[in-house]
Interface confidence: low
């Protein structure tokens, strides 16, 4: 007799895949636009990204560190209109993109949350939870919490609305700390938050140095889901060398929990390489018209156009990436086993049930290395085979397809991973 | 210091049997491939064994097949070779090498002398 | 069974001047992602072991740049640009392609 297939486990549409975090939408449009109309017109980009949320924002009214004239309710014309939003979400909602409202309150201030009057800007959020859901947004992110007096009671109210309107609905906190034990606390007490910190950002080093932070935060947080990421709202460039971003794409798309982007993560947009432009909120690279300040600095190769064209680059692996995230099993909710593979590498597998199974490698050094599999680190139920097949690599040369021996398998410099094997009862 | 020391050699009757230790310091022996090479006097290298790092796999050269068995204790950071129905034959000195990472060999042992005469 | 053949088997060698070992397998040590599969080390007197040159041309460290491997496929060489007095001992060439592991008669260098 077969063996019983194992419960399905309950998936919230945030379980699904990647979301994407559009903080500037000036910046994202480029070109003297970025107002909600124009966004409309990208979701075709982002359905094609196959991530499952947009994170949108900022995009209320806010005078600069002034709560009066801050208002979580009325949209800054600047950005369009309440009807521009509704039909926004409408089209998002058709192209099965979900929105999640940032509602940070100064955003264009000092402290994000006002130095004083924090009961005041409290209810101002609790107000605006109910309105937006009321209106049909997916969910929330509020940012800079450690800003916030008293957080987790707060951080707990609010997702008390939010849950208590659907389960459908989801809230995130973003924090600048990369302090396990701060982030813990904040976990505690909410239950369902998504939480994306700075807790991985400075995990570049290592393979070695990243498994041991990857490990801690899957150990701490128990079975909780939880959101990937190397910080609350900047690029991945700006922690990461050019060479680290495939490989940092794969390990956020397969770890178990939620990727989080920043919107160009994906193209490697990166704002040193554009003279003048802020470290937080780069031009977006649409083509190379997109950042027409200084001609010849933007390279066909540096743009969502030219990407779009190489099946080699940045871009398409990300949309293989997230296509596989979206639909495999054990990547979608599997069981996740670090294990030792040799100095330099971090290595695990996903499982889940009777499930195609997945075998990531990564080398994070900049040498070759050869890897030596250490299965006595794998429970018994994810054991590895002799040879996996190999689904992807983050570097161009190898036969996709081919079976890799698993004791022979010699990774290059800076090179991932993704290979696939059968489970054998 | 990084080393590995063998010990258990000796002097055995054909028929007999012994056991090899192989003690690891300065590393962890449960995160690399182990081996035993040994080299009869005055001839050259001859792989013995293999065993892999959690001790679910073990190879063997024909001539000591059925009758060796490569072992491990991870927790006593040590390496056995058991043998029996020895040959005069096997008579050399055992080396034990650690395998670097699915590359080559980069730690050898002093070796142990295995005596096999009556 | 790879067989490995080694020439010559006796390698007498004034000082400072080069040397060339041969190493010859019956079957391509060439695995599919590029490597090959072959290992030199010397033994020198009393010692055990130690590795010169791993996956056919790469000098493992700490051994002198004097010594340098070529090779691919079935046809391996180990090459001394200039003998030293501590080079003296038996060169031998390996396999770690597939097991059993099978290493080469041994070539005895001698200083002359």
């Known amino acids: 007799r077969a063996p019983r297939c194992r419960e399905l486990p309950a998936q919230k549409w945030w379980h699904t895949g990647a979301l994407y975090r559009i903080g500037d939408l000036q910046a994202f449009q480029g070109h003297g636009a970025g107002n909600l109309a124009g966004l409309k017109g990208r979701l075709d980009y982002l359905s094609s990204l196959k991530v499952k949320g947009l994170v949108l924002g900022p995009i209320h009214k806010n005078q600069k560190d002034d709560v009066a004239q801050t208002d979580l309710l009325q949209i800054d014309p600047n950005f369009g209109s309440k009807e521009d939003f509704d039909s926004l979400l409408q089209s998002a909602k058709k192209k099965s993109i979900r929105v999640i409202l940032d509602l940070t309150p100064n955003y264009r201030g000092e402290n994000s949350w006002f130095s004083t009057q924090v009961d005041t800007v409290a209810t101002k959020v609790k107000d605006a939870l109910e309105f937006w859901l009321q209106a049909g947004v997916d969910g929330f992110q509020v940012r800079d919490i450690e800003n916030l007096k008293d957080a987790s009671s707060f951080l707990a109210e609010w997702q008390n609305i939010t849950k208590g309107f659907s389960e459908d609905r989801l809230l995130i906190a973003g924090t600048n700390s990369s302090d396990l034990q701060q982030i813990l606390s904040l976990l505690e007490s909410n239950k369902d938050l998504l939480l994306t910190s700075s807790y991985l950002s400075d995990s570049g080093s290592t393979g070695e140095h990243t498994k041991s932070l990857v490990t801690q935060y899957l150990n701490a947080t128990g079975n909780r889901w939880c959101s990937w990421s190397l910080s609350q709202a900047r690029l991945l460039t700006s922690f990461l060398p050019a060479q680290l971003l495939r490989l940092y794409q794969l390990m956020l798309f397969t770890l178990p929990g939620t990727p989080v982007f920043s919107y160009g993560d994906e193209i490697g947009l990166d704002a040193a390489a554009l003279p003048g432009q802020p470290m937080e909120a780069p031009v977006m690279l649409w083509d190379e018209s997109s950042f027409p300040d200084i001609p010849g600095a933007v390279s066909a190769n540096m743009t969502v156009k030219g990407q779009s064209e190489d099946p080699g680059s940045l871009l398409s692996l990300f949309r293989r990436l997230s296509d596989q995230r979206s639909k495999e099993r054990s990547l979608l909710h599997g069981d996740f086993h670090a294990f030792s593979a040799g100095p330099g590498l971090f290595s695990y597998i996903r499982h889940w049930d009777q499930n195609e199974r997945f075998l990531v490698v990564l080398n994070f050094g900049d040498v070759g290395l050869s890897a030596g599999l250490q299965a006595s680190d794998l429970p018994a139920s994810a054991s590895l085979p002799a040879k996996a097949d190999l689904l992807l690599s983050t570097q161009p040369g190898r036969e996709e397809g081919s079976p890799l021996e698993l004791e022979r398998l010699k990774l290059e410099p800076h090179e991932g991973l993704l290979l696939r094997f059968p489970y054998a009862a | 210091e990084v080393q590995l020391v063998e010990s258990g050699g000796g002097l055995v009757q054909p028929g007999g049997s012994l056991r090899l230790s192989c003690a690891a310091s300065?590393?962890?022996?449960?995160?690399?491939?182990m081996h035993w090479v040994r080299q009869a006097p005055g001839k050259g290298l001859v792989w013995v064994s293999r065993i892999n790092s959690d001790g679910s796999s073990t190879s063997y050269a024909d001539s000591v097949k059925g009758r060796f068995t490569i072992s491990r204790d991870n927790a006593k950071n040590t390496l056995y070779l058991q043998m029996n129905s020895l040959r005069a034959e096997d008579t050399a000195l055992y080396y034990c090498?650690?395998?670097?990472?699915?590359?080559?060999?980069?730690?050898w042992g002093r070796g142990t002398l295995v005596t096999v005469s009556s | 069974d790879i067989v490995m053949t080694q020439s010559p088997l006796s390698l007498p060698v004034t000082p400072g001047e080069p040397a060339s070992i041969s190493c010859r397998s019956s079957?391509?040590?060439?695995?599919?992602?590029?490597?090959?599969?072959l290992d030199w080390f010397l033994q020198k007197p009393g010692q055990s072991p130690q590795l010169l040159i791993y996956?056919?041309?790469n000098r493992a460290s700490g051994v002198p740049d004097r010594f340098s491997g070529s090779g691919s496929g079935t046809d391996f060489t180990l090459k001394i640009s200039r003998v030293e007095a501590e080079d003296v001992g038996v060169y031998y060439c390996m396999q770690t392609l597939e097991t059993p592991y099978t290493f080469g008669q041994g070539t005895k260098l001698q200083i002359k």
């Open positions: 300065g590393f962890t022996l449960s995160s690399s491939w």
């Open positions: 079957q391509s040590l060439l695995h599919s992602h590029g490597d090959n599969y």
């Open positions: 996956l056919g041309s």
């Open positions: 090498a650690r395998w670097n990472w699915g590359w080559y060999f980069d730690l």
